[in-house]
């Protein structure tokens, strides 16, 4: 049975050209994560696995630093990176929790942080 | 360019431990990832196992419990030990490199892929 | 687990024609995905890595495409050594290699 909890950044907006920290934490479960995945839609920006450490997608590999922790650093934001973000907890015995973080990338100089909210 | 070259027994008996040594040239083993594959006659390929320059595992779940690999950066050396065999551990094993580079963050990262490879040996489990 | 579904298992194909071999997986893995060539007795040699990047001295009549599940990788102009058994390897989640598409003369 899966008792676990994802809790995300929720839904986040930054600056055009500025840089944006995506954070996951999953809880409520003694599963043990074997693999983070990091997806922008339906695109692969970063694998976190327990073991190996990280590998960052080619086409993302200029613009994305791992970490801090399992979250993932995006930089050199544009307009087009607005949109969904999810990641991916691979997890044993559990199988899998996803969460949802919605990034808006905005041209002005306000950029608000909205509220942070859970995914069952 | 990068050069990796298995060795070890080519006969094993059931129930004892199989033990590979592959050893690295042309480059330095204190960077990249390294990898253990096999494939059993007339078959495909399964990974067994990588291991990082600084010693982290990760092993194939179906063999977790049976296989450790270890580096010793002072021979530029990467060694495999498979427990308990049996006929089916019957392959041709293959060391290899995966490799890895340098994000923004200044950390190594994997690659995901194979792009060296030894030529391979063949280990027989049989009595 | 990810499964890796190779198609054909094998064919037959004559130099000079142009081969296509598809790779399925079980669930998406973006674009992490390699490609080998294996010839008897010989250790396999990486193709195309990231689903359509040719490996440094891969000739380019090799080229790969596709993301998601499905996946293809084409032979242009089939040459006298390009005979071999040619595998996928998906490196999404865990590390998982199709069964293997053996190509043979004509």
């Known amino acids: 049975m899966m008792t676990g909890t994802i809790e995300t950044t929720g839904n986040i907006s930054a600056e055009k050209g500025g840089s944006i920290i995506l954070q996951c934490h999953l809880s409520s479960t003694t599963a043990q994560v074997t693999q983070v995945n990091w997806e922008q839609q339906d695109q692969l920006l970063a694998i976190c696995n327990a073991d190996l450490g990280w590998h960052i997608s080619p086409s993302f590999k200029d613009r994305v630093a791992p970490g801090p922790g399992l979250g993932l650093t995006l930089q050199s934001l544009t307009v087009n990176d607005t949109g969904e973000y999810f990641c991916i907890y691979h997890t044993y015995p559990d199988g899998t929790y996803t969460g949802r973080i919605f990034l808006e990338v905005l041209e002005s100089s306000v950029a608000e942080h909205g509220a942070r909210f859970q995914i069952p | 360019e990068v050069q990796l070259q298995e060795s070890g027994p080519g006969l094993v008996k059931p129930s004892e431990t199989l033990s590979l040594t592959c050893t690295v040239s042309?480059?330095?083993?204190?960077?990249?990832?390294w990898g253990w594959i096999r494939q059993p006659p007339g078959k495909g390929l399964e990974w067994i196992g990588f291991?990082?320059?600084?010693?982290?595992?990760s092993y194939n779940p179906s063999l977790k419990s049976r296989v450790t690999i270890s580096v010793d950066t002072s021979k530029n050396q990467f060694s495999l030990k498979l427990s308990s065999v049996t006929a089916a551990d019957t392959a041709v094993y293959y060391c290899a490199r995966m490799p890895s580079f340098i994000t923004l963050a200044s950390l190594s990262t994997w690659e995901g892929y194979f792009d060296f490879w030894g030529q391979g040996t063949m280990v027989t489990v049989s009595s | 687990d990810i499964q890796m579904t190779q198609s054909p298992s094998s064919l037959s194909a004559s130099v000079g024609d142009r081969v296509t071999i598809t790779c399925k997986a079980s669930?998406?893995?973006?674009?992490?995905l390699a490609w080998y060539q294996q010839k008897p007795g010989k250790a396999p040699k990486l193709l195309i890595y990231?689903?359509?990047s040719l490996q440094t001295g891969v000739p380019s009549r090799f080229s790969g495409s596709g993301s998601g599940t499905d996946f293809t990788l084409t032979i242009s102009s089939l040459q006298p050594e390009d005979f071999a058994t040619y595998y996928c390897q998906q490196y999404y989640s865990g590390w998982t290699f199709g069964g293997g598409t053996k190509v043979e003369i004509k």
């Open positions: 291991i990082t320059y600084s010693g982290s595992t």
């Open positions: 669930q998406s893995i973006h674009k992490n």
């Open positions: 990231y689903a359509n």
């Open positions: 042309g480059g330095s083993i204190s960077s990249d990832y």
